[in-house]
């Protein structure tokens, strides 16, 4: 275990076993006073909550789906530029159980009814939006056809000039289009739940994160090659380690 005492400690609160639809807080702690962290999933499947983001202390994930299950690691750093990441933390396995969460299972989890209701709303909303889109599409198509006929008869200015040629946008860098918001740092705050919703539980913690610019990974020194595992799925900005002192050890960590 390289850099055992310097690497962060990743844990899940209240538990690494999470019911489907429930919530889990991933915490990255350290002996080196790291103030920012990057989390990634080892199987490379991107998790939206983690993708390309930097976190302050913790991140609340949920409602949890089977896609969230897997092995996670975090890296720590200090907010200097360029960001240099520590060795990866201990692996943390998140297990998603089949049943929806019940109201008593965790203070940060919604009830299963709320979860089901939310999913129904999403499903219905999406269906309605698709149907409306199809109707609108056919309506526009119809209008377009009638306009063309009218234009031919009345010799009006062609409507074609006013339509957007989709092929024109192909010249743009698709990466730039997709990640336009990442060209500058975006700070976001996400509240877990309001205190009134869950009395007699820990105070609401604010998950702070910052979206990362699409920086190319900096090359690692030969001594650190074994740490060059990219922050697959969560972050593509793998850089050199923040600790020059890297050696091997096993630090037993008591589970929570």
């Amino acid at each position: 275990h390289e850099g055992g005492q310097d690497k962060p400690l990743l844990s899940a609160w209240p538990s690494a076993v999470v019911p489907r639809g429930g919530h889990v807080t991933l915490l990255c702690r350290s002996r080196l006073g790291f103030t920012i962290f990057s989390l990634y999933k080892e199987d490379g499947v991107p998790v939206p909550e983690l993708y390309n983001k930097i976190f302050w202390k913790s991140i609340l994930m949920g409602p949890v789906t089977p896609a969230h299950a897997g092995t996670y690691r975090c890296r720590g750093s200090h907010p200097r530029s360029p960001i240099e990441w520590s060795a990866p933390s201990n692996p943390l396995v998140i297990v998603v159980t089949g049943n929806s969460s019940s109201s008593s299972s965790s203070p940060t989890e919604p009830s299963s009814k709320t979860g089901i209701r939310r999913h129904l709303h999403i499903l219905i909303g999406t269906s309605v939006a698709i149907i409306l889109f199809i109707i609108l599409f056919f309506f526009l198509l119809h209008c377009c056809c009638s306009n063309k006929k009218n234009a031919a008869v009345m010799d009006q200015e062609p409507a074609g000039d006013r339509t957007v040629n989709r092929e024109d946008s192909d010249d743009q860098d698709p990466q730039e289009v997709t990640y336009a918001q990442l060209d500058h740092c975006v700070f976001t705050q996400t509240k877990i739940t309001s205190p009134s919703q869950r009395p007699k539980t820990p105070p609401t913690d604010t998950t702070m994160y910052m979206e990362l610019p699409n920086a190319k990974p900096r090359s690692l020194s030969p001594a650190h090659k074994h740490h060059s595992q990219a922050l697959r799925g969560s972050s593509r900005e793998t850089t050199a380690l923040s600790q020059n002192r890297v050696a091997s050890s096993h630090v037993p960590a008591a589970g929570i």
């Epitope: 310097d6 400690l9 609160w13 002996r31 820990p202 002192r245």
Partner: antibody, heavy 117, light 107 residues
Framework: QIQLVQSGPELKKPGETVKISCKAS????????MHWVKQAPGKGLKWMGW????????TYADDFKGRFAFSLETSATTAYLQINNLKNEDTATYFC??????????WGQGTTLTVSS | DIQMTQSPASLSASVGETVTITCRTS??????LAWYQQKQGKSPQLLVY???TLVEGVPSRFSGSGSGTQFSVKINSLQPEDFGNYYC?????????FGGGTKLEIK
């Protein structure tokens, strides 16, 4: 069994230097980081910092940067705390402690340092 | 830095009584809290970690509870050997800080 045995009491004058030792036994020394904690007479516990027992890299709490130095003699499974340019306010009992998951499961018996002119 | 507020600062109780010592933190530390007992002239001894996990060998009359910012350690049926100072410490990350301590005395 696991033990952390510290050096004996010290009586020093202001401006002098002291070096306190902490000998570990009963476990693999380089598997656990070593921390130092100060306790002034009749006061509470104050974390001073820690040393990486694999690499010798020290980390100091803000109040203990400058005159304080952590070091190791890995072959002797011993950690050291050195305090330079001693002041009266350094009068305290100093503990070494082993860290597992950021809490301290084993402690040395403490070394009492008295700084007096 | 995370501030730790321990209460009461001192407590007098009789053998056989039940006492509770509390620790409040300035920010959410989830369950990362440890409790130590220190007797006069001795080093601290770990009693509880992760807020409620009792260290092997610690009598079951001790119990830890809480999460977030509010924590407590309860001692049922006090024994003569339980008297001394008690400290809480967060193990959320550096800098580690301890509570001011609670002096538990025999009434």
């Amino acid at each position: 069994q696991i033990q952390l045995v510290q050096s004996g009491p010290e009586l020093k004058k202001p401006g002098e230097t002291v070096k306190i030792s902490c000998k570990a036994s009963g476990y693999t020394f380089t598997d656990y980081s070593m921390h130092w904690v100060k306790q002034a007479p009749g006061k509470g516990l104050k974390w001073m910092g820690w040393i990486n027992t694999e690499t010798g890299g020290p980390t100091y709490a803000d109040d203990f940067k400058g005159r304080f130095a952590f070091s190791l003699e890995t072959s002797a499974t011993t950690a050291y705390l050195q305090i330079n340019n001693l002041k009266n306010e350094d009068t305290a009992t100093y503990f070494c402690s082993r860290d597992v998951d950021l809490y301290f499961d084993y402690w040395g018996q403490g070394t009492t340092l008295t700084v007096s002119s | 830095d995370i501030q730790m507020t321990q209460s009461p600062a001192s407590l007098s109780a009789s053998v056989g009584e039940t006492v509770t010592i509390t620790c409040r933190t300035s920010e959410n530390i989830y369950s990362y809290l440890a409790w130590y007992q220190q007797k006069q002239g001795k080093s601290p001894q770990l009693l509880v970690y992760n807020a409620k996990t009792l260290v092997e060998g610690v009598p079951s009359r001790f119990s830890g509870s809480g999460s977030g910012t509010q924590f407590s350690v309860k001692i049922n049926s006090l024994q003569p050997e339980d008297f001394g100072n008690y400290y809480c410490q967060h193990h959320y990350g550096i800098p580690f800080t301890f509570g001011g301590g609670t002096k538990l005395e025999i009434k």
